[in-house]
Every structure is written in structure tokens, then in C-alpha cells.
């Protein structure tokens, strides 16, 4: 039975040209994490694998940095970065846990962080 939960940074907003940290945390499970994928809609941004470390997709190499921890930092944000982001935890023996973050990139200087929420 999958007992874990993923806590994410939830709905967040940031300024155009700025940077933002996307974070997910898997808790309430003793399953071993073998890989964490970060995806934007259907595009792979980055992978952190237990044996191979980090891999950043070539098309995002200039604007994506790993960390802190298993999070992901997006830099030089554009309005086109607005959308859904997913963290996908591959675990053994539980299987896959997925967290969702919605990022809105704003033209204005008013960018407030949304509340955190949990995805069972």
C-alpha cells in the first residue's frame, strides 16, 4: 500500500527575469527513492538518479540548476514559463508519487507565493 504523501510549493508566482525554486518533499513512507524527475507539462526538465546523479535536459541547461536538495531552480523566467510543473518520485517498493506545482510568471513587480498544499 502506498502510504507516502508529497508536499509541494503549491501555486506560486514570480517576476519575469527572476528565479524561483520548485520543491517537493516525499514523506510518510519508508520506500527507497530511486529517481526524481522534474517535468513541465510533457517536457522533461531534469532527473536526479540514485546511481547517476543529476541530468539537466540540454534545452534547459542554461536556465535550470539543481537544488537545493532534490528541488529545482528556474532562472531568467519568461512569461512562457507559466504553467504546470511536476515532480515524480520513483520509489521501491511503493511505485510512483507525483506532485504538482503551478507557476505563474508575472510582468508586474507584485509576485506573491501561494500556500503550500499536500497531494496524497
Amino acid at each position: 500500500m502506498m502510504t507516502g504523501t508529497i508536499e509541494t510549493t503549491g501555486n506560486i508566482s514570480a517576476e519575469k527575469g527572476g528565479s524561483i525554486i520548485l520543491q517537493c518533499h516525499l514523506s510518510s513512507t519508508t520506500a527507497q527513492v530511486t529517481q526524481v524527475n522534474w517535468e513541465q507539462q510533457d517536457q522533461l526538465l531534469a532527473i536526479c538518479n540514485a546511481d547517476l546523479g543529476w541530468h539537466i535536459s540540454p534545452s534547459f541547461k542554461d536556465r535550470v540548476a539543481p537544488g537545493p536538495g532534490l528541488g529545482l531552480t528556474l532562472q531568467s523566467l519568461t512569461v512562457n514559463d507559466t504553467g504546470e510543473y511536476f515532480c515524480i518520485y520513483h520509489t521501491y517498493p511503493d511505485g510512483t508519487y507525483t506532485g504538482r506545482i503551478f507557476l505563474e510568471v508575472l510582468e508586474s513587480s507584485v509576485a506573491e507565493h501561494g500556500a503550500r498544499f499536500q497531494i496524497p
Epitope: 536526479c48 543529476w54 540548476a65 539543481p66 537544488g67
Partner: antibody, heavy 117, light 107 residues
Framework: QVQLQQPGSELVRPGASVKLSCKAS????????IHWVKQRHGQGLEWIGN????????NYDERFKNMGTLTVDTSSNTAYMDLSSLTSEDSAVYYC??????????WGQGTTLTVSS | DIVLTQSPATLSVTPGDSVSLSCRAS??????LHWFQQKSHESPRLLIN???QSISGIPSRFRGGGSGTDFTLSINSLETEDFGMYFC?????????FGGGTKLEIK
């Protein structure tokens, strides 16, 4: 097997500079963070900063920002920490460690830096 | 910066005893807490990853728990090789920070 190799010791004069090295082997150097940690004799561990060899991205603790610079040479799989304007307070063991999915799963043996006239 | 407070500073116990070490964070760090053991004149060794994830090669008597601000490292039936220093580390945000350590000594 994964290894982080550091020189055993360095002796420098007060006010001088030193370049500490950490040579990685047994894994893809550009896929893991390299962290630097300070430990004064018989004391706790202090995080200095980190660098991601794949991009050169780095982060520092504010306390160490003005005294050191982190760099990498991906051709030799070596991370460096430049320390300048050294004082006796900088005498310590300096460790490098890597981070991927696991935090600090491999550590170097540490370099004992002695600042003395 | 996030401050990690470890307690007790020193713990005197007998081999065979079971102990719990505490690490408290100054703010919510979710599960981004890691435990290390360090023996005299040696490099630290990772024991527990992300609060409760076990590490290959580490005896099963070491168990981690907690989330948010309060974390524990439990050691079941201590062996003589377990004595030394224990440190926690947070990786929730930069700068990463270590706790001050707990010294586990033989009574």
C-alpha cells in the same frame, strides 16, 4: 569505486592564500554537487559552499563569501577552493563531499590547513 | 539561515542500550534532514538520508524519523563501534547548515 581525493595537509603563512583541491573519480563529475565543509579542531561541521560542475553554479554561506572562491576543472575532474587573507582562525580540516540523490554520501579524507608563521 | 539544534550535547550510555538523538530546526524544513556519524580522525559518514531513508551498508539499528522541525535518530542496542559524534544537516535551503553535534560516549 567513488573517491574524493584531498591532500593530507597544507602549511601557509598568515595573510597568504591557498588553493585546496578535491579530485573526483569513479563517477560522472559533472552530475553531482561538490560541497566544502570546515571543521576546526574538536569542533562541529560548518558548511562553506557548493558548486555544480555541470554548470559552474555555486552557493556560499555569507560568512565565507569574502574569503574563498569555488571553482572546478572538468577536464581533470577536480574541484578547488581558493582561500585568501588567511588567519589562524582558518586553521582547520577542510572536507569536500558530493551530493546527488543522497546528501553527502561520499567525503574526501580532508585537508588539514595550518596557518602559522 | 536555518539553525539546527541538537540535544543532548553529550550522552553517556552503555553498549546494549538504545538511544534517541534529537535535531530541531528553527523553521519547517519538511524532510530535508540528514544524519551523519563521525569518529575521531575520520570523515563523516552518511547514516540517514531525507529524515528516514536508510542507506546501503548502514546497520538496520540506525533509524531516522520526524519531519517539519523535529527529528530523531534512534540507535537500537548500541554497539561499541557506534560511539562518536553525530551531526544533522539540512538541505531544504541554501545555505545548508549543520547541527552542533551530539557526542555519544561510553558510560
Amino acid at each position: 569505486q567513488v573517491q574524493l581525493q584531498q591532500p593530507g595537509s597544507e602549511l601557509v603563512r598568515p595573510g597568504a592564500s591557498v588553493k585546496l583541491s578535491c579530485k573526483a573519480s569513479g563517477y560522472t563529475f559533472t552530475s553531482y554537487w561538490i560541497h566544502w565543509v570546515k571543521q576546526r579542531h574538536g569542533q562541529g561541521l560548518e558548511w562553506i559552499g557548493n558548486i555544480f560542475p555541470g554548470s559552474g553554479t555555486s552557493n556560499y554561506d555569507e560568512r565565507f563569501k569574502n574569503m574563498g572562491t569555488l571553482t572546478v576543472d572538468t577536464s581533470s575532474n577536480t574541484a578547488y577552493m581558493d582561500l585568501s587573507s588567511l588567519t589562524s582562525e582558518d586553521s582547520a580540516v577542510y572536507y569536500c563531499a558530493r551530493e546527488g540523490l543522497y546528501a553527502f554520501d561520499y567525503w574526501g579524507q580532508g585537508t588539514t590547513l595550518t596557518v602559522s608563521s | 539561515d536555518i539553525v539546527l539544534t541538537q540535544s543532548p550535547a553529550t550522552l553517556s550510555v552503555t553498549p546494549g542500550d538504545s538511544v534517541s538523538l534529537s535535531c530541531r530546526a528553527s523553521q519547517n524544513i519538511r524532510n530535508s534532514l540528514h544524519w551523519f556519524q563521525q569518529k575521531s580522525h575520520e570523515s563523516p559518514r552518511l547514516l540517514i538520508n531525507y529524515a528516514s531513508q536508510s542507506i546501503s551498508g548502514i546497520p538496520s539499528r540506525f533509524r531516522g524519523g520526524g519531519s517539519g522541525t523535529d527529528f530523531t535518530l534512534s540507535i537500537n542496542s548500541l554497539e561499541t563501534e557506534d560511539f562518536g559524534m553525530y551531526f544533522c544537516l539540512q538541505s531544504n535551503s541554501w545555505p545548508y547548515t549543520f547541527g552542533g553535534g551530539t557526542k555519544l560516549e561510553i558510560k
